[in-house]
Interface confidence: low
């Protein structure tokens, strides 16, 4: 398993599949999008990223979805952080939360290959999709709930879709939202967000002894 020494005092060593969903709309300027990426990279520094512990995916969404990192990518954590830091700014007119949740449901979590791990989608949203695109929004959120995927919306700035955020929160008690006035607040909320995610994930069970090594005590 490819792992690296921890870079911070707080280090999340849990069983977790975490998907970062980045709003690629022009509601964020290119400089603001850089800060959003810095936040993602910073979060990744605080996770024990490996195929055994925390697996991560990074998706930028606009009218479609563009995956930069998949859960099964076997790369060093530093390389994954480098890839995340190079996500391209789309600056598109539309960023469809419905489309990216559909993508998360049917592409990323189509097969649950780690039932023992928690599944979380961190939805970083700064815009509102057009009404016509949001027809199946609730259906996708419910689909994710059925697959035990926790959706944590992070609303950023004045144009974040608060109605959708509230709908996500209503679906499950774990779907806790963070609403921030700008990207600059991400760094102040970083520790709270990462510890909340980490608390939702189980610790690895203690290693079980192979059958032939089981200890027998005779009374």
């Amino acid at each position: 398993d490819i792992s690296e020494p921890p870079l911070h005092d707080f280090y999340c060593s849990r069983l977790l599949d975490l998907v970062f969903l980045l709003d690629g709309s022009s509601r964020l300027s290119e400089a603001e999008f850089e800060v959003l990426k810095a936040f993602v990279v910073d979060m990744m520094e605080r996770l024990r990223i490996s195929q055994k512990w925390v697996r991560v995916a990074v998706v930028e969404y606009h009218d479609g979805s563009h995956a930069y990192i998949g859960l099964k990518d076997r790369k060093r954590p530093s390389e994954l952080r480098r890839i995340a830091s190079q996500v391209k700014y789309a600056g598109s007119q539309v960023a469809s939360t419905s489309e990216v949740l559909k993508y998360t449901l049917f592409q990323i979590f189509s097969k649950i290959d780690r039932p023992e791990a928690s599944r979380i989608a961190l939805l970083l949203m700064a815009s509102q999709e057009p009404q016509r695109m949001s027809r199946n929004f609730v259906r996708y959120v419910q689909g994710l709930k059925k697959k035990k995927v926790i959706v944590i919306p992070v609303g950023i700035g004045p144009h974040a879709n608060l109605k959708q955020i509230r709908l996500i929160e209503k679906q499950a008690p774990e779907n806790k939202a963070f609403v921030l006035s700008s990207v600059d607040e991400l760094e102040q909320q970083r520790d709270e967000i990462v510890s909340y995610l980490c608390d939702l994930a189980p610790e690895a069970p203690p290693p079980t002894l192979p059958p032939h090594m089981a200890q027998v005590t005779v009374g």
């Epitope: 870079l7 911070h8 400089a31 850089e34 800060v35 990426k37 810095a38 936040f39 990279v41 910073d42 520094e45 830091s85 600059d184 760094e187 102040q188 970083r190």
Partner: nanobody, 123 residues
Framework: QVQLQESGGGSVQAGDSLTLSCAAS????????MGWFRQAPGKEREFVAA???????EYADSLKGRFTVSRDNAKKLVWLQMNGLKPEDTAAYYC?????????????????WGQGTQVTVSS
């Protein structure tokens, strides 16, 4: 690419104040978190303070209250104001920059480093 140049070091008495400056070159200064580290002879480099582009600050617990970090994005400058200096503050002080916008407290997370400026505090 970011080049960093520290200045302002020198020899002072215990209890004195000193302000270190770090001048940066490069167009992207306003996107980088900046940090100050120090290294005393025979010791490891240790974190002092850091500041993000939006002026969010972090300090080493032992230095809180005595040291203040600030920056001017337009002038591409970072300062470390040190008050109530003690002999144990004697060290080479280094300015560092991260590629990202978030502060960090460990040296390996910084991508660019200055040459350092010496601070000597005598009792």
């Amino acid at each position: 690419q970011v080049q960093l140049q520290e200045s302002g070091g020198g020899s002072v008495q215990a209890g004195d104040s000193l302000t270190l400056s770090c001048a940066a070159s490069g167009r992207t200064f306003s996107m980088h978190a900046m940090g100050w580290f120090r290294q005393a002879p025979g010791k490891e480099r240790e974190f002092v303070a850091a500041i993000s582009p939006s002026a969010f600050t972090e300090y080493a617990d032992s230095l809180k209250g005595r040291f203040t970090v600030s920056r001017d994005n337009a002038k591409k400058l970072v300062w470390l104001q040190m008050n109530g200096l003690k002999p144990e503050d004697t060290a080479a002080y280094y300015c560092a920059a991260r590629r990202g916008a978030f502060t960090a407290t460990t040296a390996p997370l910084y991508d660019y480093w200055g040459q350092g400026t010496q601070v000597t505090v005598s009792s």
